[in-house]
Amino acid sequence: TQNKALPENVKYGIVLDAGSSHTSLYIYKWPAEKENDTGVVHQVEECRVKGPGISKFVQKVNEIGIYLTDCMERAREVIPRSQHQETPVYLGATAGMRLLRMESEELADRVLDVVERSLSNYPFDFQGARIITGQEEGAYGWITINYLLGKFSQKTRWFSIVPYETNNQETFGALDLGGASTQVTFVPQNQTIESPDNALQFRLYGKDYNVYTHSFLCYGKDQALWQKLAKDIQVASNEILRDPCFHPGYKKVVNVSDLYKTPCTKRFEMTLPFQQFEIQGIGNYQQCHQSILELFNTSYCPYSQCAFNGIFLPPLQGDFGAFSAFYFVMKFLNLTSEKVSQEKVTEMMKKFCAQPWEEIKTSYAGVKEKYLSEYCFSGTYILSLLLQGYHFTADSWEHIHFIGKIQGSDAGWTLGYMLNLTNMIPAEQPLSTPLSHSTYV
């Protein structure tokens, strides 16, 4: 008789990452009977929503439904119909919405109400939309990468199943860079976390973790650029800003009203004698680096040591996974290889930033100019943030692993968020059951 395949008993979950620059929908899948096992949940789909982040819809909320349609319809196609009504949907909004809420709680609520209404109109089990805290964003990113790397599994293996695996249970730190904020999260070595706001305690799979985390609002790559421009235009003699962070020959007109739209530039705001100014690129890495450093206040620290702006940071410990924009930018610049030293990265950035804009456009003809123009700044910013902001050194640089995906799942906070909300990370180690790996029928 022919062997008949048993229907697979699987579950699905959907998380929307409503970031400052765009929204992405992730679909996760796992075997129903292994919910508490570590490493069984994996990503089956990512759908990037066309358009900006949800905070940009504040004056056109009626367009949010259409904006979400394509990716939600994609979820309908990917997930079997029989599972739709049981599939939880979560939306987490990050720093773009934190900034909007700082400006107007009422406007942020309006956006979230319309988002919730739109998502509730699909046949899934919608569980709500909320603005997650920076601390949550850091924590869930840390959970995601360590879950995917198998760091919570108590079984020691003699073989390596994932890249970066050092075959021990030492967790990886998490470095996340978004458009509006950046997070650093890791387990310090026998170090007291001096500021309670930065301390997290977890018990996962029977083990206790004391985790340090901080989210720097306004220090995502896009908001950091706005900050830098607002700072530099203060001392410009006229409406021309010669900017070392853009390629020679690059020109762009910026509205002063756009510059001062974000709460992140409030500290630099001043009355300017013009409504617009023109950025003229001069492409100088060193000068760009110096300009970026002025965004980090390192003169004040009420703790034994700080990152910047008076924020406590314990000594760095162990390996780190750097993901989201850390990865996307470095991947574009071809600098994600483990073999590339920090000195080499700096050298490559010097060369890249010095390349004329016309040459860059020709070399990367398929890349949107808006993104292409900002890689010099973003790459320089990443180096400045990691080296001067977080105190990585030429030696500890090799402990940074630029990670896009781990075993097919994107590194980021969304998986950790879903694992937490669906109670799939038990505090205690689940009892292993016979036939847990292969059941013969």
Epitope: L112, D113, S120, N121, P123
Partner: antibody, heavy 116, light 107 residues
């Protein structure tokens, strides 16, 4: 179980206002929105407006100028107020608890007659 | 505004039969359609959302189908308690609009 109980007057004078309270139980107004719909023999079912979880509202443009929907989440109450009623506003007015725009749970209805 | 047209004001059927109530939208509404049942003297009750998904507790003899502009509510094995008026509603865009209703009469 989920219930929406409506209370309000049965008779309203022309040009006066109509106020209806919808008290919900079995769910929280922090996780559900409340739509308002009316039904009359001449016009069938007409959507009037909605108040969402965080308190923002959407109204049918045809009624926007004379309609107000508010709520008191702690008391699980939603308040519907329509001004300047005319005889053709005579209808049964319903509140409905919703996650989105399909009306999951309906109140028992409030029969309103506009007459002098 | 999107007009939802239920062409049959009333339909007559017998217990055990299968009946289809139709609804046509004046423009594409995707699958953003709900169906309601209203028994005499009662409030409407939700049956179907997203064109084809039954609310929990709704008997599986009620089936919704369609997308775009044409939608159908099918009742298979009609029971005497199905005597009611059935309304469709679109929620693809505001204002939300309802069909005029179809009364189901049991012979």
């Amino acid at each position: 179980q989920v219930q929406l109980k409506q209370s309000g007057p049965g008779l309203v004078q022309p040009s006066q206002s109509l106020s209806i309270t919808c008290t919900v139980s079995g769910f929280s107004l922090t996780s559900y929105g409340v739509h308002w719909v009316r039904q009359s023999p001449g016009k069938g079912l007409e959507w009037l407006g909605v108040i969402w979880r965080r308190g923002s509202t959407d109204y049918n443009a045809a009624f926007m100028s004379r309609l107000s929907i508010t709520k008191d989440t702690s008391k699980s109450q939603v308040f519907f107020k329509m001004n300047s009623l005319q005889t053709d506003d005579t209808a049964i007015y319903y509140c409905a608890g919703v996650r989105g725009d399909a009306m999951d749970y309906w109140g028992q209805g409030t029969s309103v007659t506009v007459s002098s | 505004d999107i007009v939802m047209t239920q062409s049959h004001k009333s339909m007559s059927t017998s217990v055990g039969d299968r009946v289809s109530v139709t609804c046509k939208a004046s423009q594409n509404v995707g699958t953003n359609v709900a169906w309601y049942q209203q028994k005499p003297g009662q409030s409407p009750k939700a049956l179907i959302y997203s064109a084809s998904y039954r609310y929990s507790g709704v008997p599986d003899r009620f089936t919704g189908s369609g997308s775009g502009t044409d939608f159908t509510l099918t009742i298979s094995n009609v029971q005497s308690e199905d005597l009611a008026e059935y309304f469709c509603q679109q929620y693809n865009s505001y204002p939300l609009t309802f069909g005029g209703g179809t009364k189901l009469e049991i012979k």
